[in-house]
């Protein structure tokens, strides 16, 4: 008699990560009997919320239930209905949450509590909404990308199944770059790590790591760039203000009470004799990356080297993934090949910067203008964070890998923080059992 | 020492307008909240307007929803309630209250008070 | 708004402990804050977030509670002490009880 093939015996899970800009929801499914495997989990469905993030509900957090809707109704139609009671679901809130929660921990804990609310009135087993920390955010992302490399697997194998691997146990590192915050996470060789506020000890899968994480608030690409504004227009001798970091012919009005909005500009806070200015762009790649620099605080530091901000960082090492906004904008660009050096990213960074608005609209008619001006700000920061921030340099620019998806699942935290609340990466490597019989009869 | 001195009070009538200020000094004014509180002669307390520390927040109490604006002036360490259309009702001792912080957290209770400003309304 | 119903008075004598309660009309979790205003002069901060002393507060003042019922409690109470409490809660737009005035027998 021929074999039957069983109904599938597989587990869904939800996270929803609620960023400074947008709120994501992620679907994530895997084989029942094989919980404990490593590299089993993978990614189903990507639903992006329609709105900002989380944070701007502030003021109208009546309107959170309806914001969400679409999205849970969408898990609704993945998640076949027998499942759905036994689906956790997640949310994690990052940088926009807590720079909230600096201004007051009872409106972030308002707007918490109407999304707990919100997302208890689905079948699901809703499992709490929270912040999360940056040390966590930045310890998940790189689980997430060393589950997917197949890193954490005891099993070496002749062939490779994603395009990074190389086909050793030596993890990556993980570079994740958001709105309003950025993590760089990875295992050092043999450094002590100075700073205890920046030190992970894991054991995953019969294998100790100890890893280097920080999380740098308000050095996310939006925030970084309100910061540049804020410390600029102090010394802008009107209210134009001339920006090399947007393409020329580029002209934007922005408010002064906008720019005061985040605490991250409260250091360059100072009273101005306009309400609103104008940004004109003028386009110069280089004068960009001399006034991001000086957003990076590098005069000083209490350990044996620093990344900014007198911020503790071990000498790189190893291979890196880099992605969220690290990804997004590069792939824009058209940088995210292993073949570009840094010197090629530069120059292409030059021309694009120096390119006129009004070409740059008409070649990319289809993208936002919001969005699309703000490329070459973006670009120039990444190149900036990276080698000035990070310490990396052109040669070890090649040991970054600008990543998207790793297997069809994205890299970011929300997988790890997932694996780790489901109890998915046991800390010693499970008993290896003969090929599961259970699938066909 | 924090020091928050209350300024502008006096008598108006129904209907003019009144702007109060307050000089904050001895703390780093925005990294805090600031409000403005008031108590009628021999009653309770009631909250008027709450500013955060950066202008993420600004709320008013329903019964001074668009008559009264708080602003803030942080190079000048100033907080500021402009009123208009007053009526007798909001005759009371105004003051200027700073938010508190649960560690690294702004919090929405007042942990220091000015000694406040008198405003009477009447014709 | 959240409502707060505090008991008006009490009377005590020094050196005996006393509870001031204060009943929210909806839950406001841990955001329960009590002030101390004597006559003539602006209100004090004793207790942030149910349970929490403010600085400089002596240690006879404590709180407790979450949800919708709380309390202050002096222990002992001294002559001093002679004045109207408040409760606030933060969860919701700021509100205050109406007050519990407190006289020494």
């Known amino acids: 008699t021929q074999n039957k093939a069983l109904p599938e015996n597989v587990k869904y899970g939800i996270v929803l990560d609620a960023g400074s800009s947008h709120t994501s929801l992620y679907i994530y499914k895997w084989p029942a009997e094989k919980e404990n495997d490593t590299g089993v989990v993978h990614q189903v469905e990507e639903c992006r919320v329609k709105g900002p993030g989380i944070s701007k509900f502030v003021q109208k957090v009546n309107e959170i239930g309806i914001y969400l809707t679409d999205c849970m109704e969408r898990a609704r139609e993945v998640i076949p209905r027998s499942q759905h009671q036994e689906t956790p679901v997640y949310l994690g809130a990052t940088a926009g949450m807590r720079l909230l929660r600096m201004e007051s921990e009872e409106l972030a804990d308002r707007v918490l509590d109407v999304v707990e609310r919100s997302l208890s009135n689905y079948p699901f087993d809703f499992q709490g909404a929270r912040i999360i920390t940056g040390q966590e955010e930045g310890a998940y992302g790189w689980i997430t990308i060393n589950y997917l490399l197949g890193k954490f697997s005891q099993k070496t194998r002749w062939f490779s199944i994603v395009p990074y691997e190389t086909n050793n146990q030596e993890t990556f590192g993980a570079l994740d770059l958001g709105g309003a915050s950025t993590q760089v996470t990875f295992v050092p060789q043999n450094q002590t790590i100075e700073s205890p506020d920046n030190a992970l000890q894991f054991r995953l899968y019969g294998k100790d790591y100890n890893v280097y994480t920080h999380s740098f608030l308000c050095y996310g690409k939006d925030q970084a760039l309100w910061q540049k504004l804020a410390k600029d227009i102090q010394v802008a001798s009107n209210e134009i203000l001339r920006d090399p970091c947007f393409h020329p012919g580029y002209k934007k009005v922005v408010n002064v009470s906008d720019l005061y909005k985040t605490p991250c500009t409260k250091r360059f806070e100072m009273t101005l004799p306009f309400q609103q200015f104008e940004i004109q762009g003028i386009g110069n790649y280089q004068q960009c990356h001399q006034s991001i620099l000086e957003l990076f605080n590098t005069s000083y530091c209490p350990y044996s080297q620093c990344a900014f901000n007198g911020i503790f960082l071990p000498p790189l090492q190893g291979d890196f993934g880099a992605f969220s906004a690290f990804y997004f904008v590069m792939k824009f660009l058209n940088l995210t090949s292993e073949k570009v050096s840094q010197e090629k990213v530069t120059e292409m960074m030059k021309k694009f910067c120096a390119q006129p608005w009004e070409e740059i609209k008409t070649s990319y008619a289809g993208v936002k203008e919001k969005y699309l001006s703000e490329y070459c700000f973006s670009g120039t920061y990444i190149l900036s964070l990276l080698l000035q921030g990070y310490h990396f340099t052109a040669d070890s620019w090649e040991h970054i890998h600008f990543i998207g998806k790793i297997q069809g699942s994205d890299a970011g935290w929300t997988l790890g923080y997932m694996l780790n609340l489901t109890n998915m990466i046991p800390a010693e490597q499970p008993l290896s059992t003969p090929l599961s019989h259970s699938t066909y009869v | 020492e924090v020091q928050l001195v209350e300024s502008g009070g006096g008598l108006v009538q129904p209907g003019r307008s009144l702007k109060l200020s307050c000089l904050a000094s001895g703390f780093t004014f925005n990294n805090y909240g600031m409000n403005w509180i008031r108590q009628a002669p021999g009653k309770g307390l009631e909250w008027v307007a709450s500013?955060?520390?950066?202008?993420?927040?600004?709320s008013y109490a329903d019964t001074v929803k668009g008559r009264f604006t708080i602003s803030r002036e942080n190079a000048k360490n100033t907080l500021y309630l402009q009123m208009t259309s007053l009526r007798s009702e909001d005759t009371a001792l105004y003051y200027c209250?700073?938010?508190?912080?649960?560690?690294?957290?702004?919090?929405?209770?007042?942990?220091?008070w000015g000694q406040g400003v008198m405003v009477t309304v009447s014709s | 708004d959240t409502v707060l119903t505090q008991s008006p008075a009490l009377a005590v004598s020094p050196g005996e402990r006393v509870s001031i309660s204060c009943r929210a009309s909806?839950?406001?979790?841990?955001?329960m804050h009590w002030y101390q205003q004597k006559p003539g002069q602006q209100p004090k901060l004793l207790i942030y977030k149910a349970s929490n002393l403010a600085s400089g507060v002596p240690a006879r003042f404590s709180g407790s509670g979450s949800g919708t019922d709380f309390t202050l409690t002096i222990d002992p109470v001294e002559a001093d002490d002679t004045a109207t409490y408040f409760c606030?809660?933060?969860?919701?737009?700021?509100?205050f009880g109406a007050g519990t005035k407190l006289e020494l027998k």
């Open positions: 500013f955060s520390s950066s202008s993420t927040y600004i």
């Open positions: 606030q809660q933060s969860w919701n737009d700021p509100t």
């Open positions: 909806e839950g406001v979790k841990s955001y």
């Open positions: 209250v700073r938010h508190g912080r649960y560690g690294g957290y702004g919090g929405f209770y007042f942990d220091y």
